[in-house]
Every structure is written in structure tokens, then in C-alpha cells.
Interface confidence: low
């Protein structure tokens, strides 16, 4: 700035203000004096001449500097704007990240809750399954107990099948019919024991003229032994008749036991055919002779287990054992209570 100030001062001196050129003298003193003055003059004029070009250059330089500065400034502004934009974007991203984090936390907690609910429901289902299985077992047990009770109740009963019906029938008439059967088929039994009957009746109790076959007669003895003696005697005799016509004597069993006995049918027939001397014993046990011993079987599964170690027997009973068993625990039918 100082330099500029001097120049401006020099610039203010005009030509009219400068003295006219002096004559040159040859004396050293005057020569010196002339030289100094002349030098001053030259400096002044030279300054004036060089001053404008220098200034012009200076202004041009400064202009370029300003231009450069402006460009730098613009660049800076652009950079600031970009930075601001980036910052804004970063802030938005940060907000989004926070929101996503919150959403994730929320979803996570919801998933946790759903998991809780699912596991609670699974627990409930397992509990229900357990209860269901337990209930099924209980029902099975109850049905078995009921079957056993019925069989126990019916133990002293004898069932007479195929005895013709007459128009007027009462207890006494049926009792006489039984005495006739005993006399005709088991005279020894009639002599041996006093046949004591607790009750005797047709079943079902209601008579229907539409029935093709006579209703069964249920005889309830006071003692089980009497019933068993009669059954044994009937087995030994092979053919039981009434007035010459064939009739059948069987134990009076519960519907379930009858079903269980029926299920032994195919197996029984095969064993009978092959001379294994099968028998169905009370209430529904299958027995037959194998390896010189009498073997007893409560159900098909027990027999299955037995034949696994006996290939010949397994082959023999293969089909009969694989046949799908009817539901053993059917709804209980009405039993004739005796």
C-alpha cells in the first residue's frame, strides 16, 4: 500500500510545475548540479511514463486475483452446499436408522410376544393331547371295567337258542321247558343235582310276530357251577335237542366279550383245521396246544408276539392276524339285566 501511496504522490506533479531544462556547464560543480537536477527530472518523467503501465498491470493482476478469489469462494460455497446436503442426508439416514431400529425393536418385541403366544398355545395343545390320551385310557379302562362287571353279572346265566315260542308263555312254562331240555339231554345231571333257577325269561322281552327266529331264553342259576356243568355236558354230548329238534346252549356274555370271541373266529378255524385243539375260554381267551403245552392268549397282540419266534405258526396265522380288528370297544348295547 505504501508503494501505491508514493506513486499517487508522484502522479500529482504536473509538467507545468516543472522548471525548464537548464544549460549544461562544463564545471564539475555545475555538472554535478545539473546531473542531480536532470536526474530528478528524468525520474519524475520516467515515473509518469512507467506509472500507468505499472498500474494497468497491477489492476490486471488484482482483477485476476479477485476473479480467482471469487472462483475459490464459489468453490467453497459449492463445497459448503454439498456438505450441507450430505449432512442433511446423513441426518435423514440417522433418523431413518433410528426409526428402523425402533421398528426392529418393536417387531422383535412383537415376535417375542408371538413366540410366547405360540409356545403357550403349544403347551396348551400338548396338555390337551396329554389329557386326550389320558381320557382315552380312562374310557378304555372304564369300558373294560364295565365289560368285566357285565360278564361277572352274567356269569351264572345260560343262553338257550332256538327254543320255539308258544303263544302263552310265563316263568313256570319256561322253567318246565328247561327241565324238559335237561331230562332229554342230561338225565344224569337231573339225577345228580337239584337244578335251582333264580330267574328265566325271553330276551328281548317284547314279543314280535315279525321275528323269523324265536327269541333267546336267558336262564339265571343260583350257582355258577350249575351253568358250567350244563355247558360242559352240552359240549360232551355235542348235539342238544328239545323234542328232537336241535337247540344251542351258550354262556350269556357281554356284547364286548361276544365281539372279542367273534374276533378269534378265523384264527380258531385255522388252528382247529391244523389240529391245535383250540378253545375259547371265559371270558374271551383263546387257548391251544403248542409244543405239548396249553397256551393262553388274551388278545391278538399277545398271539402276534408269541408267533414272532415260531416261523411255522407265524406263516400259518399270517393273514388272520393281519386282518384289521373291529373296534373292540364299541358303544355298549343294552344288556338284558338278570
Amino acid at each position: 500500500m505504501g508503494k501505491k501511496q508514493n506513486r499517487k504522490t508522484g502522479n500529482s506533479k504536473t509538467q507545468s510545475a516543472s522548471p525548464p531544462p537548464k544549460e549544461r556547464s562544463s564545471s564539475p560543480a555545475t555538472e554535478q548540479s545539473w546531473m542531480e537536477n536532470d536526474f530528478d527530472e528524468l525520474r519524475e518523467e520516467g515515473f509518469r511514463r512507467s506509472n500507468y503501465s505499472e498500474l494497468r498491470e497491477d489492476i490486471q493482476t488484482k482483477g485476476k486475483e479477485v476473479e480467482n478469489f471469487e472462483k475459490n469462494l464459489e468453490e467453497c460455497i459449492t463445497r459448503i452446499t454439498n456438505t450441507e446436503k450430505c449432512l442433511k442426508e446423513l441426518m435423514e439416514l440417522k433418523t431413518k436408522a433410528r426409526e428402523l431400529r425402533e421398528e426392529c425393536r418393536s417387531l422383535r418385541s412383537r415376535c417375542d410376544q408371538l413366540e410366547e403366544r405360540v409356545s403357550a398355545m403349544e403347551d396348551e395343545m400338548n396338555e390337551m393331547k396329554r389329557e386326550g390320551k389320558f381320557r382315552e385310557k380312562r374310557i378304555k379302562r372304564n369300558e373294560q371295567s364295565l365289560q368285566e362287571i357285565w360278564d361277572y353279572v352274567k356269569r351264572p346265566n345260560l343262553r338257550l337258542i332256538g327254543v320255539p315260542e308258544s303263544d302263552v308263555e310265563n316263568g313256570t312254562k319256561l322253567e318246565n321247558t328247561l327241565q324238559d331240555i335237561i331230562q332229554e339231554n342230561f338225565p344224569n345231571l337231573a339225577r345228580q343235582a337239584n337244578v335251582q333257577i333264580q330267574e328265566i325269561q325271553r330276551t328281548p322281552q317284547r314279543y314280535s310276530s315279525r321275528r323269523a327266529t324265536p327269541r333267546h331264553i336267558i336262564v339265571r342259576f343260583t350257582k355258577v357251577e350249575m351253568k358250567e356243568k350244563m355247558l360242559r355236558a352240552a359240549r360232551e354230548k355235542g348235539r342238544v335237542t328239545l323234542k328232537g329238534k336241535p337247540i344251542r346252549l351258550t354262556a350269556d356274555l357281554s356284547a364286548e366279550t361276544l365281539q372279542a370271541r367273534r374276533e378269534w373266529g378265523p384264527i380258531f378255524n385255522i388252528l382247529k383245521e391244523k389240529n391245535f385243539q383250540p378253545r375259547i375260554s371265559y371270558p374271551a381267551k383263546l387257548s391251544f396246544i403248542s409244543e405239548g403245552e396249553i397256551k393262553y392268549f388274551i388278545d391278538k397282540q399277545m398271539l402276534r408276539d408269541f408267533v414272532t419266534t415260531r416261523p411255522a405258526l407265524k406263516e400259518l396265522l399270517k393273514e388272520a392276524l393281519n386282518m384289521e380288528r373291529n373296534n373292540r370297544y364299541q358303544p355298549l348295547q343294552n344288556h338284558a339285566k338278570m
Epitope: E102, E103, R105, S109, R110, D112, Q113, L114
Partner: nanobody, 123 residues
């Protein structure tokens, strides 16, 4: 569209109890986080309590903590607010709210659905 209907608002003496109930219709309540807000005359609406979808997480404002209990019955589509040891400063209109995305730090803006409100006055 989910609709919320509050009931149970009443005039009660200080120290007394009140049970507010909110019935949710037009949607399954178990799909929503539920909450209660209140607004006293001349004051901002403020958060009272909220409960998560399954009811496993609950939140209470400091002013009601220990006195109010929030519960829900998803089978009946209801949310209840049991208010005990009521104070005069509990006097306000109580609003039932529902939110799709339950947050552990609920703000008023988060809640998507609002009921009409029920007046509770503690004298």
C-alpha cells in the same frame, strides 16, 4: 376401520377407585398395542399407560405408577384401566388409543386410533 369406545368415567371422591373400559370394534384388539391418555382442562394431552399386544409389557407415567393398572382381554377385545387412590389432579378426559407398532417409549403421535374419551372427575 378400528373404533374405540370408552366407558366407566364418573364422579368419584378422592381416594376412591374407578375402572375404565375400552371396547375395540372393527378389528382384532390383539393386533394393536393399546394405551390410555388423558387431558385435563387447559392442559396438554398426556400419556397415562400402555400395554403391548399380548399384555406381557406395560408402561405407566410416573404420576400414576403404583395406583393405576392396565390390563387387556383379547378374547373380549377390551382394554381396562383400574384406577385406585384417585387424586383431584387425576380429573381429566381419558382417551383410549390403539397403535399398530407398539413402542417402549410411546408418544402421542405414535398412536393411530383414538376414542372419543370419557370424563373422570375426582372431588
Amino acid at each position: 376401520q378400528v373404533q374405540l369406545v370408552e366407558s366407566g368415567g364418573d364422579l368419584v371422591q378422592a381416594g376412591g377407585s374407578l375402572r375404565l373400559s375400552c371396547a375395540v370394534s372393527g378389528g382384532t384388539s390383539s393386533n394393536y398395542g393399546m394405551g390410555w391418555f388423558r387431558q385435563a382442562p387447559g392442559k396438554e394431552r398426556e400419556f397415562v399407560s400402555s400395554i403391548s399386544w399380548s399384555g406381557s409389557r406395560t408402561l405407566y407415567s410416573d404420576s400414576v405408577k403404583g395406583r393405576f393398572t392396565i390390563s387387556r382381554d383379547n378374547a373380549k377385545n377390551t382394554v381396562d384401566l383400574q384406577m385406585n387412590s384417585l387424586k383431584p389432579e387425576d380429573t381429566a378426559v381419558y382417551y383410549c388409543t390403539a397403535v399398530r407398532e407398539y413402542r417402549d417409549y410411546p408418544q402421542r403421535d405414535n398412536f393411530d386410533y383414538w376414542g372419543q374419551g370419557t370424563q373422570v372427575t375426582v372431588s
